[in-house]
C-alpha cells in the first residue's frame, strides 16, 4: 500500500503557499487529483513528488496515490484545502448527468473546512430548492442530491456563509435523465 507524506488526512494552507506531496510505494506510483494549475511532478522509481510553489483555491481537492502494480489495488489519499477568503468554492465540474434515482454529486469543494457549518445548496438566482429535495454535504466532495428526480434538472449554486454574508459558487447544471 502506498504512503503519502505529509502523513495527515487533511492539509490546510493559504493561497501562494508552497505545497509538497510525496507518495512512496513498493513499485512505481501514480497520482490522481483535481485538474488544477501549477503542479509539477517528479517521479523517481517507487517515489513520486507533486509540488507547487503557488497554491491557489483551484488546488483544493483530494489527491490519491495508487500503485498500479499492486494486486490488492491499495491507495492512499490526502485532502488539500487552499483557504482563499475570496473563493470559498472550487467547482470541479459545471455539468453533472445522472439517471433518475441515482445520487447526483455536485462537485463544489469547500476551500476552508471552517466554513462547513454555514453551507447550503440553492438554485440559481437564490431560488430555494424544490420541495422534498434530499441532500447532504461533504467538504471533501460537495453536495449530493439523493435519488435525483427528472424534475430536479436545474442549475444549482453552492452557498457558504462568510463574515455574515452568503458567497455563491459558479453554477452547476444538473441533468437528470429518465430511465427508459
Amino acid at each position: 500500500i502506498p504512503v503519502i507524506e505529509p502523513s495527515v488526512p487533511e492539509l490546510v494552507v493559504k493561497p501562494g503557499a508552497t505545497v509538497t506531496l510525496r507518495c512512496v510505494g513498493n513499485g512505481s506510483v501514480e497520482w490522481d487529483g483535481p485538474p488544477s494549475p501549477h503542479w509539477t511532478l517528479y517521479s523517481d522509481g517507487s517515489s513520486s513528488i507533486l509540488s507547487t510553489n503557488n497554491a491557489t483555491f483551484q488546488n483544493t481537492g483530494t489527491y490519491r496515490c495508487t500503485e498500479p502494480g499492486d494486486p490488492l489495488g491499495g491507495s492512499a489519499a490526502i485532502h488539500l484545502y487552499v483557504k482563499d477568503p475570496a473563493r470559498p468554492w472550487n467547482v470541479l465540474a459545471q455539468e453533472v448527468v445522472v439517471f433518475e434515482d441515482q445520487d447526483a454529486l455536485l462537485p463544489c469543494l469547500l476551500t476552508d473546512p471552517v466554513l462547513e457549518a454555514g453551507v447550503s445548496l440553492v438554485r440559481v438566482r437564490g431560488r430555494p430548492l424544490m420541495r422534498h429535495t434530499n441532500y447532504s454535504f461533504s467538504p471533501w466532495h460537495g453536495f449530493t442530491i439523493h435519488r435525483a428526480k427528472f424534475i430536479q434538472s436545474q442549475d444549482y449554486q453552492c452557498s457558504a456563509l462568510m463574515g455574515g454574508r452568503k458567497v455563491m459558487s459558479i453554477s452547476i447544471r444538473l441533468k437528470v435523465q429518465k430511465v427508459i
Epitope: I1, E5, P6, P9
Partner: antibody, heavy 118, light 107 residues
C-alpha cells in the same frame, strides 16, 4: 463536540501486559486516523502508534521503541481505539493520550497513566 | 528518523512581552510542522498546523513561520494564560517526532 476518553491504565510489573482503550464521540469515527502519544518527564512527548481509516486500509504505524510489543487496533462500530501493550518495560511508564489526527493532533483525551514497576 | 531540536528549553518572561520559540528539523519537512501548548496537568492543545496556520479558536497574538528545516512560534504581548509548555512536531512521515519542549514561566 469532539470527545476522547482513555481508560485501562494502572500499575503493572515489568514483562506484563496491559490494554488501553479510547472511546470517541462527536465526529465520524470511521473516517478518522487515530494515534496514541505518551508523555513522561524523562522522554517528554513521544508518539507511539497510529491506525488510519478504512479508506486507508486501516494501515498501522509504530514507534521503533514499541514495534513488536504494542498493537494498535480499532472497532469502528464502537467508535473505539485500543493499544495492546505486551512485554512492558519501566521506560514505558507515562501518561498515554489518545489523539485524533486531522491537520495535526487536533483533539486529545485527558490521558491514562501507566506505571511499569516491580 | 527526523529529529526535532527545540530551543530554548525554558524561558522566564513577563506579561506583555513578545517571545519566539524555535524548532529545527534534521531534514526538510516541507512546512509540515505543528505547535502545541500544554498547561500544567492538562492535555496538549493544537495551536498551529502546516507551520503557519492557526488552529480554530487560537488568538491572533500567536503566529507560526518557517520553511525547510527552520521554524518558529511567536507570541506577541504575552497574556497570563499563555504560560505553560510548548512543543513542535513534524508530520513528514512516521515516526512523528516531537521537540523537547519549551517551558514558559512567569518572571
Amino acid at each position: 463536540e469532539v470527545k476522547l476518553e482513555e481508560s485501562g491504565g494502572g500499575l503493572v510489573q515489568p514483562g506484563g501486559s496491559m490494554k488501553l482503550s479510547c472511546a470517541a464521540s462527536g465526529f465520524t469515527f470511521s473516517d478518522a486516523w487515530m494515534d496514541w502519544v505518551r508523555q513522561s518527564p524523562e522522554m517528554g512527548l513521544e508518539w507511539v502508534a497510529e491506525i488510519r481509516s478504512k479508506a486507508n486500509n486501516h494501515a498501522t504505524f509504530y514507534a521503533e521503541s514499541v514495534k513488536g510489543r504494542f498493537t494498535i487496533s480499532r472497532d469502528d462500530s464502537k467508535s473505539s481505539v485500543y493499544l495492546q501493550m505486551n512485554s512492558l518495560r519501566p521506560e514505558d511508564t507515562g501518561i498515554y493520550y489518545c489523539t485524533r489526527v486531522k491537520v495535526g493532533f487536533d483533539n486529545w483525551g485527558q490521558g491514562t497513566t501507566l506505571t511499569v514497576s516491580s | 528518523d527526523i529529529q526535532m531540536t527545540q530551543s530554548p528549553a525554558s524561558l522566564s518572561v513577563s506579561v506583555g512581552e513578545t517571545v519566539t520559540i524555535t524548532c529545527r528539523a534534521s531534514e526538510n519537512i516541507y512546512s509540515n510542522l505543528a505547535w502545541y501548548q500544554q498547561k500544567q496537568g492538562k492535555s496538549p492543545q493544537l495551536l498551529v498546523h502546516a507551520a503557519t496556520n492557526l488552529a480554530d479558536g487560537v488568538p491572533s497574538r500567536f503566529s507560526g513561520s518557517g520553511s525547510g528545516t527552520q521554524y518558529s512560534l511567536k507570541i506577541n504581548s504575552l497574556q497570563s494564560e499563555d504560560f505553560g509548555s510548548y512543543y513542535c512536531q513534524h508530520f513528514w512521515g512516521t515516526p512523528r517526532t516531537f521537540g523537547g519542549g519549551t517551558k514558559l514561566e512567569i518572571k
